[in-house]
């Protein structure tokens, strides 16, 4: 058993049918010695008397808020949560497996630049009685500081019969060094509590691997005289690291007809302009990627040819 | 060339070669199914590689103040990786395919290190750790780890040379 926060304790339960459970001793936080009784949640049933209460925690029915009283007065509370292990595996019931980029991906994180700021998000089908707390550090044995805000509900989606809720959190490395080569990964730890169930989720990554630039901005077309060709120009997104001579992007320019089946013409360039043939009803899209490290491409920025 | 006394390297040549190194490092080890090599344990194998750290002066301001600290660090790393790519980790079983980019990568690391340091001037180099994995699968895993680490290293080096070519070239 360990303390999650003041008066909230997590009991680690290795569960299997007929498991003996975990013996837990609760102590009433009071100088009083006599006349103390214990109850669980809203029930008035007395579970025991004395300054300590010994319970055998076998299932969620044994978890909840234990209260010690004396003569009708509440002395202290202890909330017991369960962290359940089955077949040697800690439960992961609260969050959905996003399966991208691989199975058992519960947390996904992205950064728009090398400033040490990143966003993580996760999905759940649970709508109530749910709390999250997020901690992060650079490295684990001698951790360096990363400050995370509060997790907030960022989107709701309907998936078939189900509603899906997306939560996200923003974190910032305290002493980020954008130009350095990372040698220790960022660790992100999310504590999730639903009703009386505690679970924890972790992710470990280098900022360089989660970079996804914003789409290029100010995408413009300039027709070339007496030609079907156009000059496409764009700019680095505002959120990208500076100076651009150091933090350089590469770009992919795509001409796409109305029909998805039409052949796409693609050009790759390090410049912020390109000359392409603009077909009727086609659109021109540009996306960006770090020039020197193959992390994610940005989303497309698009303009119609006409 | 970065010669004793600290004159400037051939920034543009270094830029071109370092960008080529980036391309080669990724073609040698593309992100196959997002294999997370940090989960594979045996951290000490790639913990000893030289990293371009915060105090190494490889940021834009540090390069403007005195690029020599950074260039020395990059040179150390190039020599270190060049030795690794020439060691039995890469020459032993399982054999690399004949058209593997590792050979070109090895040659380009050497080429860039020579651009940075002419004959007769020696910066101290980092000792290469004695890594001799006994099993072919261990060797394969080590290759992946080294290449992933090299990708990060050459990305920073390429940024340095691109910025130098744009802002520090005579």
């Amino acid at each position: 058993i360990w303390e999650l926060k003041k008066d909230v304790y997590v009991v680690e339960l290795d569960w299997y049918p007929d498991a003996p459970g975990e013996m837990v001793v609760l102590t009433c936080d009071t100088p009083e010695e006599d006349g103390i009784t214990w109850t669980l949640d809203q029930s008035s049933e007395v579970l025991g008397s004395g300054k300590t209460l010994t319970i055998q925690v076998k299932e969620f029915g044994d978890a909840g808020q234990y209260t010690c009283h004396k003569g009708g007065e509440v002395l202290s509370h202890s909330l017991l949560l369960l962290h359940k292990k089955e077949d040697g595996i800690w439960s992961t019931d609260i969050l959905k497996d996003q399966k991208e980029p691989k199975n058992k991906t519960f947390l996904r994180c992205e950064a728009k630049n090398y400033s040490g700021r990143f966003t993580c998000w996760w999905l759940t089908t649970i709508s109530t009685d749910l709390t999250f707390s997020v901690k992060s550090s650079r490295g684990s044995s001698d951790p360096q500081g990363v400050t995370c805000g509060a997790a907030t509900l960022s989107a709701e989606r309907v998936r078939g019969d189900n509603k899906e809720y997306e939560y996200s959190v923003e974190c910032q490395e305290d002493s980020a060094c954008p130009a350095a080569e990372e040698s220790l990964p960022i660790e992100v730890m999310v504590d999730a509590v639903h009703k009386l169930k505690y679970e924890n989720y972790t992710s470990s990554f280098f900022i360089r691997d989660i970079i996804k630039p914003d789409p290029p901005k100010n995408l413009q077309l300039k027709p070339l005289k007496n030609s079907r060709q156009v000059e496409v120009s764009w700019e680095y997104p505002d959120t990208w690291s500076t100076p651009h001579s150091y933090f350089s992007l590469t770009f992919c320019v795509q001409v796409q007809g109305k029909s998805k089946r039409e052949k796409k013409d693609r050009v790759f360039t390090d410049k912020t302009s390109a000359t392409v043939i603009c077909r009727k009803n086609a659109s021109i899209s540009v996306r960006a990627q770090d020039r020197y490290y193959s992390s994610s491409w940005s989303e497309w920025a698009s303009v119609p040819c006409s | 060339r970065a010669v004793p006394g600290g004159s400037s390297p051939a920034w543009t040549q270094c830029q071109q070669l370092s960008q080529k190194l980036c391309t080669l490092a990724w073609s040698a080890h593309p992100l196959v199914g997002h294999m997370d090599l940090r989960e594979e344990g045996d951290e000490e194998t790639t913990n000893d590689v030289p990293h371009i750290q915060c105090g190494d002066g490889c940021d834009p301001q540090g390069l403007r103040d005195n690029s020599q600290f950074c260039l020395q660090r990059i040179h150390q790393g190039l020599i270190f990786y060049e030795k690794l790519l020439g060691s039995d980790i890469f020459t032993g079983e399982p054999s690399l395919l004949p058209d593997s980019p590792v050979g070109q990568l090895h040659a380009s690391l050497l080429g860039l290190s020579q651009l940075l340091q002419p004959e007769g001037h020696h910066w101290e180099t980092q000792q290469i750790p004695s890594l001799s994995p006994s099993q072919p699968w261990q060797r394969l895993l080590l290759r992946f780890k080294i290449l992933r680490s090299l990708q990060a290293f050459v990305a920073v080096a390429a940024r340095v040379f691109a910025h130098g070519a744009a802002t520090l070239s005579p």
Partner: nanobody, 123 residues
Framework: EVQLVESGGGVVQAGESLRLSCAAS????????MGWFRQAPGTEREFVAS????????FYADSVKGRFTISRDNTKNTVYLQMSSLKPEDTAVYLC????????????????WGQGTQVTVSS
């Protein structure tokens, strides 16, 4: 959000068997841990059995262990209670419940309830 409808109750002789079904509709069935409870007139609701969302783990009250089997079919959105060697003291209204906590024998840990199906065991 989840509607539960029990069926399969009836009158049987002691020692006989019965299979109860509980059909779920609404939200995704496989998100929920499922349970069976029973309530005889004038008594508290009593836990019978529960099953986790994947159907890989089950949990039983001591009074039914070895006689009752809970199972589920996530493709049919249905949970079952196979009752054998029935006794007169098994007579009750059997209620199906859906919740988020497994294992739990406590009724307030379940969020959704069916109306129940009557099982009467005569001697």
């Amino acid at each position: 959000e989840v509607q539960l409808v029990e069926s399969g109750g009836g009158v049987v002789q002691a020692g006989e068997s019965l299979r109860l079904s509980c059909a779920a509709s609404g939200r995704s069935f496989s998100d929920y841990e499922m349970g069976w409870f029973r309530q005889a007139p004038g008594t508290e609701r009593e836990f019978v059995a529960s099953i986790n969302r994947r159907g890989s783990s089950t949990f039983y009250a001591d009074s039914v262990k070895g006689r009752f089997t809970i199972s589920r079919d996530n493709t049919k959105n249905t949970v079952y209670l196979q009752m054998s060697s029935l006794k007169p003291e098994d007579t009750a209204v059997y209620l199906c419940a859906a919740g988020w906590l497994f294992p739990s024998s406590r009724s307030r840990d379940y969020d959704y309830w069916g109306q129940g199906t009557q099982v009467t065991v005569s001697s």
